[in-house]
C-alpha cells in the first residue's frame, strides 16, 4: 500500500510540476522592468523567452515575437532548449509512469516490467526537473549580470545635459514558477525512483505444502522465516498459515538493481 | 458615439471641498484608464490625475496630491474628482479624459469650471 | 518630472505654406521594449477642448488629416503641416505620456498672416 501512495504521489507532484515547467516556459514575465528609479511609470516592459511585451498605464498591451533566430543571445537559446528539454522527457516520463502506476492492471504486465518503468520515468522526471531549474538559474544569472551593466548614464545633448535611464529588468514572476515546478518535479521523480524499489519482484517461494502430525495441526511452510536483509524485510518471526498467500501490504521486497541508482 | 460630460463645478471658497462627475457612454467605461486634465483661464493645459482600469491604481500631480482623489464607479459609468482644500490656483476649467494607446488622450469632455475664490 | 519645453511660442505663417513646431522633453521618451517614444501632439482650437492628433510621436489618429506628420526621437520631437490650412489655427500641445506625472509643453500657438 505505502509502494502504491509513493509511486502514485510521485506520479502527481511530478504531473504538477510538469504542467508548471510548461506554464513557466510560455510566461511572459521571465524579466520584468525594475521599477525601483521610476516606481509610477506609465509603461511597464516585460519579456519572456518567445517574446517581449509593453504594457501600458492605458491598459494597452502590446507583445512582440522574437522572429529571429540568430539574432538572439546564445544564452537565451541556451534556456529555451533547456526548457524544451524538460518539458519534452517531463512528457515521456509521465507516460511511462502511466503505465508503470499499480492500481492501473494492463494485460499479464509482471512487477518487474513496472518497477523499471516506474524507475525510467523517475529518472526522466529528475533530469526533467533539473532541466528546467538550470534554464531558470541561467536566465536569472544572467538577467543579475545585465542589470548591474545596465547602469544609468549621462550624455551630453542639444542644449545641455539630457539624463536617459537605461531600462533594467529583474526576476519575473516566470522564474519563481519554473524554480518551484522544476523543484516539484525532481521531487516526484525521487519518490517515483523510491516506489521502484518496493515494486521490485520477491524471490520465488516454494508452495506451501501442509504435513499433518498426529495431534498436532500446525502448517509448516519451508522458507516461513526469512532472513533478514535489512531492506523492508519483516523482521518479525511470524509463522505463516495461508500457504503463501499475502496482501499486497505483506508483500516484501529484496535488494535489486533498481536499489543502487 | 463616444461622449464624456462634466459636472459639478462651480464657485466655491479657498478651503472649500468641490465633487466632479464625468459621466461616460459610448464605450465600455470599465475597460479604459481615465484622467482629469485642467487648464487654468489663458493658460496651457495641466494633468490632475489618472485612475487605471481594473484594479484601479491612482497616480497624481504633486500640486494636487493629498488634497484630490480620483475614482470611479464602473457600474454608473461615472468618473470623479473629489477636490479638498481648494486654492486659488486649482481655478481652472477640468476636463475629463480617456486614454488610449500610447497613454494618449483620445476622447475629451467639454470641461467643467471651477472657480475658488473668496 | 519630465520637462516639456516647446518652440516658438507662436507663429503666424501664410495658407498653404509648410509649418514645423518643436518639442524638447528634459528624459528621452524613447521606450527601450518596443522602441516606441512616448510623446503626443494635441491641437486646442478656441473655445473648444483639445484634440488628439498624433501619439507614439509619429502615429496619426484616425480622423486626422494627412497634412498633419510627426516625427523624431529620445528627446527632440517636430509637429509638421504640410499645407496650413485656415481651421489649423490653433494651439498645439506636445506631452509626456511615458512616465507620471504626464506633462505637456507651454504650447505653440499658429495664427495665418
Known amino acids: 500500500m505505502a509502494v502504491t501512495a509513493c509511486q502514485g504521489l510521485g506520479f502527481v507532484v511530478s504531473l504538477i510540476g510538469i504542467a508548471g515547467i510548461i506554464a513557466a516556459t510560455c510566461m511572459d514575465q521571465w524579466s520584468t522592468q525594475d521599477l525601483y528609479n521610476n516606481p509610477v511609470t506609465a509603461v511597464f516592459n516585460y519579456q519572456g523567452l518567445w517574446r517581449s511585451c509593453v504594457r501600458e498605464s492605458s491598459g494597452f498591451t502590446e507583445c512582440r515575437g522574437y522572429f529571429t533566430l540568430l539574432g538572439l543571445p546564445a544564452m537565451l537559446q541556451a534556456v529555451r532548449a533547456l526548457m524544451i528539454v524538460g518539458i519534452v522527457l517531463g512528457a515521456i516520463g509521465l507516460l511511462v509512469s502511466i503505465f508503470a502506476l499499480k492500481c492501473i492492471r494492463i494485460g499479464s504486465m509482471e512487477d518487474s516490467a513496472k518497477a523499471n518503468m516506474t524507475l525510467t520515468s523517475g529518472i526522466m522526471f529528475i533530469v526533467s526537473g533539473l532541466c528546467a531549474i538550470a534554464g531558470v538559474s541561467v536566465f536569472a544569472n544572467m538577467l543579475v549580470t545585465n542589470f548591474w551593466m545596465s547602469t544609468a548614464n549621462m550624455y551630453t545633448g542639444m542644449g545641455g545635459m539630457v539624463q536617459t535611464v537605461q531600462t533594467r529588468y529583474t526576476f519575473g514572476a516566470a522564474l519563481f514558477v519554473g524554480w518551484v515546478a522544476g523543484g516539484l518535479t525532481l521531487i516526484g521523480g525521487v519518490m517515483m525512483c523510491i516506489a521502484c524499489r518496493g515494486l521490485a519482484p520477491e524471490e520465488t517461494n516454494y508452495k506451501a505444502v501442509s504435513y499433518h502430525a498426529s495431534g498436532h495441526s500446525v502448517a509448516y511452510k519451508p522458507g516461513g522465516f526469512k532472513a533478514s536483509t535489512g531492506f523492508g524485510s519483516n523482521t518479525k518471526n511470524k509463522k505463516i498459515y495461508d500457504g503463501g498467500a499475502r496482501t499486497e501490504d505483506e508483500v516484501q521486497s529484496y535488494p535489486s538493481k533498481h536499489d543502487y541508482v | 458615439e463616444v461622449q464624456l460630460l462634466e459636472s459639478g463645478g462651480g464657485l466655491v471658497q479657498p478651503g472649500g471641498s468641490l465633487r466632479l462627475s464625468c459621466a461616460a457612454s459610448?464605450?465600455?467605461?470599465?475597460?479604459?484608464?481615465m484622467s482629469w486634465v485642467r487648464q487654468a483661464p489663458g493658460k496651457g493645459l495641466e494633468w490632475v490625475a489618472t485612475?487605471?482600469?481594473?484594479?484601479?491604481?491612482?497616480y497624481y500631480a504633486d500640486s494636487v496630491k493629498g488634497r484630490f482623489t480620483i475614482s470611479r464607479d464602473n457600474s454608473k459609468n461615472t468618473l470623479y474628482l473629489q477636490m479638498n482644500s481648494l486654492r486659488a490656483e486649482d481655478t481652472a476649467v477640468y476636463y475629463c479624459?480617456?486614454?488610449?494607446?500610447?497613454?494618449?488622450?483620445?476622447?475629451w469632455g467639454q470641461g467643467t469650471l471651477v472657480t475658488v475664490s473668496s | 518630472d519630465i520637462v516639456m519645453t516647446q518652440s516658438p511660442d507662436s507663429l503666424a505663417v501664410s495658407l498653404g505654406e509648410r509649418v514645423t513646431m518643436n518639442c524638447k522633453s528634459s528624459?528621452?521618451?524613447?521606450?527601450?521594449?518596443?522602441?516606441?517614444?512616448?510623446l503626443t501632439w494635441y491641437q486646442q482650437k478656441p473655445g473648444q477642448p483639445p484634440k488628439l492628433l498624433i501619439y507614439?510621436?509619429?502615429t496619426r489618429e484616425s480622423g486626422v488629416p494627412d497634412r498633419f506628420s510627426g516625427s523624431g526621437s529620445g528627446t527632440d520631437f517636430t509637429l509638421t503641416i504640410s499645407s496650413v490650412q485656415a481651421e489649423d489655427v490653433a494651439v498645439y500641445y506636445c506631452?509626456?505620456?511615458?512616465?507620471?506625472?504626464?506633462?505637456f509643453g507651454q504650447g505653440t500657438k499658429l495664427e495665418i498672416k
Open positions: 479624459t480617456r486614454l488610449t494607446k500610447g497613454n494618449a488622450m483620445d476622447y
Open positions: 459610448g464605450f465600455t467605461f470599465s475597460s479604459y484608464t
Open positions: 485612475i487605471s482600469s481594473g484594479v484601479s491604481y491612482t
Open positions: 528624459q528621452s521618451l524613447l521606450n527601450s521594449g518596443n522602441q516606441k517614444n512616448y
Open positions: 507614439w510621436a509619429s
Open positions: 506631452q509626456n505620456d511615458y512616465s507620471y506625472p504626464f506633462t
